[in-house]
């Protein structure tokens, strides 16, 4: 395979590098379904975009296999710590793959933000950020889950979001 | 456009890829102006650097249009929660663009760190990290703001910082 | 140096770009040594991998000089705030270089998570994330330290981790 063949290959690689897969999805009122499913995201308007990745029912879907830095931030907030709400909030990025029926944990955080409020009527805010490099195959999906999602606060797509890019 | 022309283009792209835009700016005593403006940053000393991006009055200035992972961390701290300080701290990355003179929110976090202190004389520390991919045009600027900036604690450029790189 | 020589160089660069240095190391029961040294990490099993970087005694070792986005997250947790534990937890990424005997701080966070617990018997959780771009020379090492590491909670490599990739 001499320079001629390699040339085509290189040109192809250059073109594919131009669209290095990347995405940034943003939170909206419709993000929180209350159904026990993952968070849903805005994919087109505002700051949201998909480039070389696709989206389906809350999931970033990988088109091109490789190592990806995946990240998510969620804005948490409440008034005091109402009974019935877990004192621990779990925010995680999970992988869905055709080979396994159950989601696989990728990156997870646990926080106890309610404890910050010194009185039951005090407003509190907290934020959880996750980011890390994982290997993803074509067709695999990544979703964000928050338990208890009732404490996620959405506004304008800048406070809760989900994204990825190939490294 | 045969291999000869493409060759030059590829060499050019290779050279430009060698300087994939990136920057990391660090906090310094002069970062907090108290003027209501954005935080200011060290751009050259210590861990700070600019590569394919420039800096002006607190802002990272984009030279080459594209998608950038932008990030910032601020170290927060105080003694109790003094009256007159907001119980909510907002830490955000904002974009300035000539067509839209008012800053546009990109990534934002709200936190209530004071509530952690169980007594009014207790020292507390907290940290806020933001990161995400956004599209930036040549000439656009990104700044960091913290409200209330009086709670930002600066020391040696490792605890509060601001950076970006093209993805 | 005409197209022929440049061709080899370009092919070489393409090959090296295919293995853009990246790593993600995960927490394990053996991460916490109690010896005052840095945290140790899983490098092969589960989500952990090394690509174009190596590992030695808790450190990511750089093979190829350049700018790297380095990151770490640690999961913190406890029951109340036991006496003898510092009220401040420091989580940092540090560089070891042959030229300097002492570690150099790169990115650091301080947090006071215990203060969240409103009673001495209450379980609390918190998470600390750090990420930023730094320049690393071949042979330099990056480690993670947490003081007090007794508050780091490890489980299945998804809650505490350490990684890097060249930008």
């Amino acid at each position: 395979d001499g320079p001629a063949g390699s040339w085509e290959q290189l040109i192809q690689e250059r073109r594919s590098h131009e669209v290095n897969p990347a995405a940034h999805l943003t939170g909206a009122n419709s993000s929180l379904t209350g159904s026990g499913g993952p968070l849903l995201w805005e994919t087109q308007l505002g700051l949201a975009f998909l480039r070389g990745l696709s989206y389906h029912d809350g999931a970033l879907v990988v088109t091109k296999a490789g190592y990806y830095y995946i990240y998510s931030k969620v804005q948490l907030g409440g008034v005091g710590c109402p009974l019935g709400l877990a004192s621990t909030i779990t925010h995680g990025l999970y992988k869905r793959t055709p080979r396994y029926p159950e989601e696989l944990e990728l990156l997870v955080s646990q926080q106890s933000p309610c404890g910050r409020a010194t009185s039951s009527s005090r407003v509190w805010w907290d934020s959880s950020f996750l980011g890390g490099v994982v290997h993803l195959e074509a067709g695999e999906k990544v979703v964000v889950r928050v338990l208890d999602e009732r404490l996620v606060r959405l506004r304008d797509g800048t406070r809760s979001y989900f994204g990825a890019f190939m490294v | 456009d045969g291999p000869a022309g493409s060759w030059e283009q590829l060499i050019q792209e290779r050279r430009s890829h060698e300087v994939n835009p990136a920057a990391h700016l660090t906090g310094a005593n002069s970062s907090l102006t108290g003027s209501g403006g954005p935080l200011l940053w060290e751009t050259q000393l210590g861990l700070a650097f600019l590569r394919g991006l420039s800096y002006h009055d607190g802002a990272l200035v984009v030279t080459k249009a594209g998608y950038y992972y932008i990030y910032s961390k601020v170290q927060l701290g105080g003694v109790g929660c003094p009256l007159g300080l907001a119980s909510t701290i907002t830490h955000g990355l904002y974009k300035r663009t000539p067509r839209y003179p008012e800053e546009l929110e990109l990534l934002v976090s709200q936190q209530s760190p004071c509530g952690r202190a169980t007594s009014s004389s207790r020292v507390w520390w907290d940290s806020s990290f933001l990161g995400g991919v956004v599209h930036l045009e040549a000439g656009e600027k990104v700044v960091v703001r913290v409200l209330d900036e009086r709670l930002v604690r600066l020391r040696d450029g490792t605890r509060s910082y601001f950076g970006a790189f093209m993805v | 140096d005409g197209p022929a020589g440049s061709w080899e160089q370009l092919i070489q660069e393409r090959r090296s770009h295919e293995v853009n240095p990246a790593a993600h190391l995960t927490g394990a029961n053996s991460s916490l040594t109690g010896s005052g040294g840095p945290l140790l990490w899983e490098t092969q099993l589960g989500l952990a991998f090394l690509r174009g970087l190596s590992y030695h005694d808790g450190a990511l070792v750089v093979t190829k000089a350049g700018y790297y986005y380095i990151y770490s997250k640690v999961q913190l947790g406890g029951v109340g705030c036991p006496l003898g534990l510092a009220s401040t937890i420091t989580h940092g990424l540090y560089k070891r270089t042959p030229r300097y005997p002492e570690e150099l701080e790169l990115l650091v966070s301080q947090q006071s998570p215990c203060g969240r617990a409103t009673s001495s018997s209450r379980v609390w959780w918190d998470s600390s994330f750090l990420g930023g771009v730094v320049h690393l020379e071949a042979g330099e090492k990056v480690v993670v330290r947490v003081l007090d590491e007794r508050l780091v909670r490890l489980r299945d490599g998804t809650r505490s981790y350490f990684g890097a990739f060249m930008v």
Epitope: E42, T43, G46, F49 | - | -
Partner: antibody, heavy 117, light 110 residues
């Protein structure tokens, strides 16, 4: 400066198709969406849909699904809107506009499409 | 999703202030700070006047201001001038990749 220039007026018969172009300049075409909005004589603005120039994803208004197709040619920074099976009530001024975050700015000068037998 | 509700017409004398309302729901106007306003003179293309509820693009007079309360957004024009006579449209993000226009308001300068 950022500018959108549309193709000229069209007169079409019922049942025919029309394809309107919108050439962009002054910004990175592939980084923003192009939206299409129409306005029947004496009526308000009606959003027709948009296309993301960087990945060709489209989003069409429910009432036009199946009749409208939006495309882009990134090599010429041009967006196209094709409307098929034209009816008399499709007579309108058709505007393209850059979709910047959650608003439309700037707008093209408009293309008048008249559907008449 | 139906269009946002605007008054069909408003009028005012030169120098006066007028306000045009735009009423939606908690799923659109009330749910986000993403309301924009457009001015359209007869035979011309619409022009962005306000974005993100209250922000003005460069080149737009500071006589134009925007605000929001609950599910209603408002455009206020102070010091009314003859050239302000035009149609005004509001638009709001409504989640799920949806934008909604108002029905439009005809402003007459008496």
């Amino acid at each position: 400066q950022v500018q959108l220039v549309q193709s000229g007026a069209e007169v079409k018969k019922p049942g025919a198709s029309v394809k309107v172009s919108c050439k962009a300049s002054g910004y990175t075409f592939t980084s923003y969406g192009i939206s299409w909005v129409r306005q029947a004589p004496g009526q308000g603005l009606e959003w027709m849909g948009w296309i993301s120039a960087h990945n060709a994803n489209t989003n069409y208004a429910q009432k036009l699904q199946g009749r409208v197709t939006m495309t882009t040619d990134t090599s010429t920074s041009t967006a196209y809107m094709e409307l098929r099976s034209l009816r008399s009530d499709d007579t309108a001024m058709y505007y393209c506009a850059r979709l910047y975050r959650n608003w439309f700015d700037p707008w093209g000068q408009g293309t008048l499409v008249t559907v008449s037998s | 999703q139906s269009a946002l509700t605007q008054p069909a017409s408003v009028s005012g004398s030169p120098g006066q202030s007028i306000t045009i309302s735009c009423t939606g729901t908690s799923s659109d106007v009330g749910g986000y700070n993403y309301v924009s306003w457009y001015q359209q003179h007869p035979g011309k293309a619409p022009k962005l006047m306000i974005y993100d509820v209250s922000k003005r693009p460069s080149g737009v007079s500071n006589r134009f201001s925007g605000s929001k309360s609950g599910n209603t957004a408002s455009l206020t024009i102070s010091g009314l001038q003859a050239e302000d006579e035009a149609d005004y449209y509001c638009c709001s993000y409504a989640g799920s990749s949806t934008l909604l226009f108002g029905g439009g308001t005809k402003l007459t300068v008496l």
